[in-house]
């Protein structure tokens, strides 16, 4: 019989008036020894499922069921997975800003639309929250005596093509 609760291990509780280390009852836990009570284990139900079961020394850990994701510290609530056109942030699912898109369901981040003009191409189809811009073929303006340098793929050498 111990005289003090200070030496009690995690997974036990101890009352000062009766300083005996007692094991936590089923469905309770204590991660620190010597506490007067054990804590009730978290139950993962509904939109939650167990990620880690409760032990006498550790609380249960929950995760969200398929199609949902966790929000808040220690997964305090479940929110429906983000749909295409959204991205997951700390605050939940956020719709992609205009000029960005996400074509994935439940995952991914909003990415900027392709800038067709950087490749000298026109916009064939405008972008949406769910789809990238579709670029057209390169814009080539033919004028008399235009010289086009044609470089075959994979080769450094070029062929010169005279357009008259």
């Amino acid at each position: 019989v111990q005289n003090s609760c200070d030496n009690c291990q995690p997974g036990t509780f101890c009352r000062k008036y009766n300083p005996v280390c007692k094991s936590c009852p089923p469905s309770t836990f204590s991660s620190i020894g010597g506490q007067p009570n054990c804590n009730i284990c978290r139950v993962c139900a509904g939109y939650f499922r167990f990620k880690k079961f409760c032990s006498s020394t550790h609380n249960a850990e929950c995760e969200c069921i398929e199609g949902f994701h966790c929000l808040g510290p220690q997964c305090t609530r479940c929110e429906k997975d983000c749909r295409p056109g959204q991205e997951l942030t700390k605050q939940g699912c956020k719709t992609c800003s205009l000029g960005t898109f996400n074509d994935q369901n439940g995952t991914g981040v909003c990415r900027p639309w392709t800038n067709c003009s950087l490749d000298g191409r026109s916009v064939l189809k405008t972008g949406t929250t769910e789809k990238d811009v579709v670029c057209g073929p390169p814009v080539v303006s033919f004028s008399p005596s235009t010289t086009i340098s044609v470089t075959p793929e994979g080769g450094p050498g070029g062929h010169s093509l005279q357009v008259l």
Epitope: Q86, T95, T126, T129
Partner: antibody, heavy 120, light 107 residues
Amino acid sequence: DVQLVESGGGLVQPGRSLKLSCAASGFIFSYFDMAWVRQAPTKGLEWVASISPSGDIPYYRDSVKGRFTVSRENAKSSLYLQMDSLRSEDTATYYCARRSYGGYSELDYWGQGVMVTVSS
Amino acid sequence: DIQMTQSPASLSASLEEIVTITCQASQDIGNWLAWYHQKPGKSPQLLIYGTSSLADGVPSRFSGSSSGSQYSLKISRLQVEDIGIYYCLQAYGAPWTFGGGTKLELK
């Protein structure tokens, strides 16, 4: 309560500049995309520009591109629209609007609007 | 650009009557459609978002639906406060585009 209050409108000559401001309150401004929408007298609504929460992605309608600049100051919960090289066709009531966070891009709250008249 | 063709441009209806306004999208916009009501001299107010979801504080007599690329706003029993102009908005592709508006008056 969400509140959006526009200011800075008035009468301006063609080719001149004007800067509109929108003071936001009642929500965490830095989380939301914001937009400017205009309405010419007796006409319909026309989206003008949008800006991402951090201000790094502005987007404009073609007719104002290169002339208008949308910006924001999250620390002041303020949205701006710098309008340069103004034209008579820019005459309209300009509304500041908040885009919903996780919806379908709908503009869920609007200011009362500010009138901009471009005339010589 | 995605065109939103709204019809009718104007309509006159009696109190308690059922009113339907439609918007036709020129291309697929999924559920990225909202409806607004604008009273004279006021700013637009959100009624419906995501094609069919009712915005906070909006009476249940308003409802939204779609069939293919046609979107509808229905007012089941018209009230005096419902007069004004109604607009649809597609916020799927850039630029965001509004329908031309439907002016609703009391008969």
